[in-house]
Interface confidence: low
């Protein structure tokens, strides 16, 4: 089993749609279960500390350049939710996301109809197959939602930011 999220970071605009892509290949002939899981930032991207002191985060970050204070912390220190899961052709939304325009398309891509402020964070695409347990079964993408127009939005490459008409 091999799971790949092609975009490691996605920047999109508030109230606009986005698609988080996920590809997988498997030797299994059984239908795969696709699950998208959301993990909030360990600290607020806009600077306020959430769950971990920024001073501690920065000192740890200095010692280990691979450690990211925004993304790397125990799940107990941040919000973790199931966004949606798909088995066969049936898509089920997590409790927190019920009523939202969210679905799983093209086998494993997460489609969000209208982004909200709280959608910024880390999204994990997790694939489970009953008879292919070897390899990598998950990958992640960071989604950063910007509530901006003008220069900042326009300079984002089209494959990273999506600004679509209502």
């Amino acid at each position: 089993l091999q799971v790949t999220v092609p975009d490691k970071k996605k920047v999109a605009m508030l109230f606009q749609p986005t698609v988080l892509r996920c590809h997988f290949s498997t030797s299994s002939h059984q239908p795969a279960v696709v699950q998208w899981k959301f993990k909030s930032y360990c600290q607020d991207r806009m600077g306020e500390s959430l769950g971990m002191s920024s001073t501690r985060a920065q000192s740890l970050s200095k010692r280990n350049l691979e450690w990211d204070p925004y993304l790397d912390c125990l799940d107990s220190r941040r919000t973790v939710r199931v966004v949606a899961s798909k088995q066969g052709s049936t898509v089920t939304l997590g409790d927190f996301y019920r009523g939202r325009e969210i679905t799983i398309v093209h086998d494993a891509d997460l489609q969000i109809g209208k982004l909200m402020w709280g959608d910024s964070g880390l999204y994990y695409c997790i694939i489970t197959t009953p008879d292919d347990l070897e390899g990598k079964n998950e990958d992640s993408v960071e989604l950063l939602v910007l509530g901006r127009t003008g220069l900042l939005a326009d300079l984002l490459p089209s494959f990273a930011v999506e600004i679509m008409p209502e």
């Epitope: 490691k8 970071k9 920047v11 991207r45 806009m46 600077g47 920024s54 920065q58 970050s61 350049l65 990211d68 925004y70 993304l71 960071e142 901006r148 127009t149 003008g150 220069l151 900042l152 939005a153 326009d154 300079l155 984002l156 490459p157 089209s158 494959f159 990273a160 930011v161």
Partner: antibody, heavy 131, light 108 residues
């Protein structure tokens, strides 16, 4: 080695035109937004213009709007600044600068990283507007 | 456009000392869009920090940044002779990009 080399500066009379070039090497030029920043003699830095990675979006400082045009040729790895109706106050060293990739925040690539500053600068080319 | 005001304008300190440079923005700026640069005489600027507090590649850990809203700071914990330079803060905004007027740091 990542490098930016500006050229095209010189002495020009007020009201005339000049075209600056910035040759890029050592990185995938077509993936990054590019800026022009200038510095008048003995003064601070002043941002002039920015162009998106593919040239489709351009923004200018109010002081140059309508007179300067930023453009790029990704096939030649070159950034340009066409300066028309030059004024004495345009006298400055002109730097081209590259958007920074998101160093240290994960392996993110090829997206506009205004979040991360300008990480590579040329050595500058001097423009003097004088009669 | 957002105006950035840096203080002090000039300061002179000795090697080994700690210094904090201030950058105040005319209106609230998300700290994701604040950067600091160092410029030595006759040279191009050099990126020090982005996102208000993240060090750029190759920048020693003597340099650190903090702040939010309208007040941002650059701190150099142990001054070295080579830190003598002008330091600029910079912000990205929808309306454009602006730099502060700079703080000149002299090492005695």
């Amino acid at each position: 080695e990542v490098q930016l080399v500006e050229s095209g500066g010189g002495v020009v009379q007020p009201g005339r035109s000049l075209r600056l070039s910035c040759a890029a090497s050592g990185f995938t030029f077509s993936s990054y937004g590019m800026h022009w920043v200038r510095q008048a003699p003995g003064k601070g830095l002043e941002w002039v213009a920015v162009i998106s990675y593919d040239g489709s979006n351009k923004y200018y400082a109010d002081s140059v709007k309508g007179r300067f045009t930023i453009s790029r040729d990704n096939s030649k790895n070159t950034l340009y600044l066409q300066m028309n109706s030059l004024r004495a106050e345009d006298t400055a060293v002109y730097y081209c600068a590259k958007e920074s990739p998101s160093v240290g925040l994960g392996s993110y690539y090829d997206f506009w990283s205004g979040l991360y500053g300008m990480d590579v600068w040329g050595q500058g080319t001097t423009v003097t507007v004088s009669s | 456009e957002i105006v950035l005001t840096q203080s002090p304008g000039t300061l002179s300190l000795s090697p080994g000392e700690r210094v904090t440079l201030s950058c105040r923005t005319g209106q609230r700026v998300e700290n994701l869009f604040i950067a600091w640069y160092q410029q030595k005489p006759g040279q191009a600027p050099r990126l020090l920090l982005y996102g208000a507090s993240n060090r750029a590649t190759g920048i020693p850990d003597r340099f650190s940044g903090s702040g939010s809203g309208t007040d941002f700071t650059l701190t150099i914990s142990r001054l070295e002779p080579e830190d003598s330079a002008v330091y600029y803060c910079q912000q990205y905004d929808d309306s454009g990009i602006t730099f502060g007027q700079g703080t000149r740091l002299e090492i005695k």
